[in-house]
Amino acid sequence: DFGLDCDEHSTESRCCRYPLTVDFEAFGWDWIIAPKRYKANYCSGECEFVFLQKYPHTHLVHQANPRGSAGPCCTPTKMSPINMLYFNGKEQIIYGKIPAMVVDRCGCS
Amino acid sequence: DFGLDCDEHSTESRCCRYPLTVDFEAFGWDWIIAPKRYKANYCSGECEFVFLQKYPHTHLVHQANPRGSAGPCCTPTKMSPINMLYFNGKEQIIYGKIPAMVVDRCGCS
């Protein structure tokens, strides 16, 4: 599997992973103790035919061209969790692994 | 996890899984021995904010609203393989499990 990495200075128009910091406190999510901020990343860019297609299925649907099927879109194809320390509704401090919080790779699907 | 299922008569505008039969022969993929056709399904529809979002990350990116980030799009969130019998480039008949050929569920990511 392969995906492009870009930054704010990139001129890449194709599907790419960009850096993004999520700041929980800025969202008013003040029940999160740690991390206060984390590197989440996001996907953006164009999905030309076959570029960075994750699944053979994507190619097959494109060929079949059913009614209402949009082209593939730039979306996370590999994600990872982060460990968090947070306050739950019962006033307890909880340690937990929260899945799919970080985009590791972007692709067209 | 939850996803909508629709058919060609549905009036659903939101992200939904639709039936789609892939016909290898119609594509000219004559190296595939079996199956000649299979039920692949596909995803189509709108991703309103928070509807069918697979990842908390999708919500966080929406809140952070970085430059160039499109809204979430309707894409497979669960896929399964199919078993296939096909000719390889060396004219050998191969049996293999091909991953991510069937869409089991659609969601917004």
């Epitope: 910091t21 406190e25 103790i33 740690a34 991390p35 206060k36 901020r37 984390y38 590197k39 460990n83 306050f87 006033e91 307890q92 401090i93 340690y95 692994k97 970080v102 | -």
Partner: antibody, heavy 117, light 105 residues
Framework: QVQLVQSGAEVKKPGASVKVSCKAS????????MHWVRQAPGQGLEWMGI????????SYAQKFQGRVTMTRDTSTSTVYMELSSLRSEDTAVYYC??????????WGQGTLVTVSS | SYELTQPPSVSVSPGQTATITCSGH??????VSWYQQGSGQSPVLVIY???QRPSGIPGRFSGSNSGNTATLTISGTQAMDEADYFC????????FGGGTKVTVL
């Protein structure tokens, strides 16, 4: 200004317990979590746990679970860290530190706990 | 458990640049803070979120982080910068490096 003042040095025997206090001033005590961090002589820093002074809930580093207890007294704006079943390797300077948005800031002046028979 | 590794010591002449490294697996994917601890003193935060300086911290302190290594740079090092420096990151706990003693020759 924000200040964290800790209790004085302690000498304890192996197997005993120690209770270190940290008195906060210059801010709303119940609005900020408090961490405890220790530093053995000539060593690095080691996070021990965190307490929410508002409700008293805690989370401890795995290494100290079962041996550490963090409590607070809102009437005196003081948090406490009690470590039991002391052994020689618990000899260290123990710090309280306020949980700020950007990190541990500020820190108390530290309390030296010596465990010796 | 996650580990952060620092060199035990770094020496620098006054006015020169001191570079302190902190390495850990995919450390660039995490935010790193740096703490300064003078002899017999409590730690003081000098850098957070890889590159940010808290108010009151001189501009000669800067940070970076990519790949497996975070770096604290002290430009135009002064005698008062002689101290121990600790990197810190969040993984499954608050993790600190072993510390680097900066000596101003």
């Amino acid at each position: 200004q924000v200040q964290l003042v800790q209790s004085g040095a302690e000498v304890k025997k192996p197997g005993a317990s120690v209770k270190v206090s940290c008195k906060a001033s210059g801010y709303t005590f119940t609005s900020y979590y408090m961490h405890w961090v220790r530093q053995a002589p000539g060593q690095g820093l080691e996070w021990m746990g965190i307490i929410n002074p508002s409700g008293g809930s805690t989370s401890y580093a795995q290494k100290f679970q079962g041996r550490v207890t963090m409590t607070r007294d809102t009437s005196t704006s003081t948090v406490y860290m009690e470590l039991s079943s002391l052994r020689s390797e618990d000899t260290a300077v123990y710090y309280c530190a306020r949980d700020e948005n950007w990190g541990f800031d500020p820190w108390g002046q530290g309390t030296l706990v010596t465990v010796s028979s | 458990s996650y580990e952060l590794t620092q060199p035990p010591s770094v020496s620098v002449s006054p006015g020169q640049t001191a570079t302190i490294t902190c390495s850990g697996h995919a450390l660039g994917d995490k935010f790193v803070s740096w703490y300064q601890q003078g002899s017999g003193q409590s730690p003081v935060l000098v850098i957070y979120d890889d590159t940010q300086r808290p108010s009151g911290i001189p501009g000669r302190f800067s940070g970076s982080n990519s790949g497996n290594t975070a770096t604290l740079t002290i430009s135009g090092t002064q005698a008062m910068d002689e101290a121990d420096y600790f990197c810190q990151a969040w993984d499954s706990s608050f993790v600190f490096g072993g510390g680097t003693k900066v000596t101003v020759l």
